[in-house]
Amino acid sequence: GALEVQVPEDPVVALVGTDATLCCSFSPEPGFSLAQLNLIWQLTDTKQLVHSFAEGQDQGSAYANRTALFPDLLAQGNASLRLQRVRVADEGSFTCFVSIRDFGSAAVSLQVAAPYSKPSMTLEPNKDLRPGDTVTITCSSYQGYPEAEVFWQDGQGVPLTGNVTTSQMANEQGLFDVHSILRVVLGANGTYSCLVRNPVLQQDAHSSVTITPQRSPTGAVEVQVPEDPVVALVGTDATLRCSFSPEPGFSLAQLNLIWQLTDTKQLVHSFTEGRDQGSAYANRTALFPDLLAQGNASLRLQRVRVADEGSFTCFVSIRDFGSAAVSLQVAAPYSKPSMTLEPNKDLRPGDTVTITCSSYRGYPEAEVFWQDGQGVPLTGNVTTSQMANEQGLFDVHSVLRVVLGANGTYSCLVRNPVLQQDAHGSVTITGQPMTFPPEA
């Protein structure tokens, strides 16, 4: 039979400038001598010769004189190749071809890597900064390989993904310099961290900058809302929290509070000229009048509907003003699925049946999963449709076409992705012939 040549399955990772060993081995037969051995290392893609051993002799390196075999180990079946002073250009697949009585070959991958330097951070503009100013923060890290992954986050560890531009340029050696630019609107103060990750080495290089802007000439009102969406069930009441810090001596006569829909700017509720101007939103909103003086500008939204979903802006004006937007995520649980079978009688193994799983009046759209009695997912031949009713709630119908075995259980799981609520239904089909549902 053909000769079995063994190489590592995983790529060999080598740092730029270091030496790497590309392992390759074969099993010599009894009585094997090096005179019989023909060993060729080449680049897999281009077939360029790298190194060879033939006619009982090392034929030397054909690859910039940077390769060597392990001559003392060849007779034991060790055909490994030593590659010195690894460069980025060496990355790729190398084929180890061994020929004795028969022949065989295998390819080993070389993955080159270089760690990234600790990032340096620059700020533009870098003086006279005020809350509300837009600044450009540049994070630069050098001489890494392969291309980096760059992550930005704020002082609370929350990822910052918007307004990031990252560029990576390779130098003559093929090493990358990475420059990532974050454009951010300053708050009262903030820490911005940049993490440059080498995906091969799983090496992270971090830097951060803390910006404490000057107090603006007339300090804007800082309005606080929850970062995460407020989740409310259809038909229940929801509180959209919003708060500000009243100055000493603050009176409600100074307060102007406006709630509106962020996108359309439609007025929802307002408090101006020292009094609650009431709901402009189907009379389903209310403030917390007893708490306003303490800086609680929250809005109560009654009998939540699907159409309420979206972003609401809380705008507070006193001596100065500020605003923040809070998201309302509406949800409704799905009903326990009902299961139907077609055909539903005289079923035999080998028959194709259609199993329908129906679940009603949920929101938002469901995720539907099918599995067999062993918990193995069933993904082929599934058709799922979701229809919204007048209230915007979805009825979901998922159809599985399956060929019956001797017996089997088929489960349908309807998941509400917001509530992380799972509604299950299952049907077990046994015996033959059989009828569904079973007759009493």
Epitope: T134, A220, D320
Partner: antibody
Framework: QVQLQQSGAEVKKPGSSVKVSCKAS????????ISWVRQAPGQGLEWMGG????????NYAQKFQGRVTITADESTSTAYMELSSLRSEDTAVYYC????????????WGQGTMVTVSS | EIVLTQSPATLSLSPGERATLSCRAS??????LAWYQQKPGQAPRLLIY???NRATGIPARFSGSGSGTDFTLTISSLEPEDFAVYYC???????????FGQGTKLEIK
Amino acid sequence: QVQLQQSGAEVKKPGSSVKVSCKASGGTFSSYAISWVRQAPGQGLEWMGGIIPILGIANYAQKFQGRVTITADESTSTAYMELSSLRSEDTAVYYCATGGSGRYALDIWGQGTMVTVSS
Amino acid sequence: EIVLTQSPATLSLSPGERATLSCRASQSVSSYLAWYQQKPGQAPRLLIYDASNRATGIPARFSGSGSGTDFTLTISSLEPEDFAVYYCQQRSNWPPSYTFGQGTKLEIK
């Protein structure tokens, strides 16, 4: 730092309209309060109206009510002031001004746009 | 509509002297009052906001005082670059609207 850049000088006929633009850079435009102030030659400052883009609410001085329209385009960070039914007394330098994010005091001003109304 | 009356209309003083400019409102404006300086051919410059707070970069010789209906801008020792026109301005609570006084011209004697 916030900057306001206004459109160029205009010469208009009586009875026509003029629309002056004011582009903001270096901050969060939607959270500004933008005011429009004019100054006739040798005269004092006159507040015409203003807008807070995040609210989309504009309000106007009584004197200009019905003749001035102030709008804001958040996508381009630009505010506009349109004055209609122009007369010779409307010849003036028109300024946009803001306090930047969340501030009412007008500490940032555009360079001014000269509007001349002449037949 | 609130009317702001500034006095005097013109004030003639010499460098080094103290200047006191007055602004009176026809009804209470709380403390939402600002002072601006304007030189020929230039946009106005904010000096004082909320009656008594100096804006960024404004020298300490400028100070504001007052509340309700009577307000004062004081320049403790006039510098040559201080000769200009000064305007007071009030802001109504809601919706935010502004009124300027007619101005006081501060000229070199």
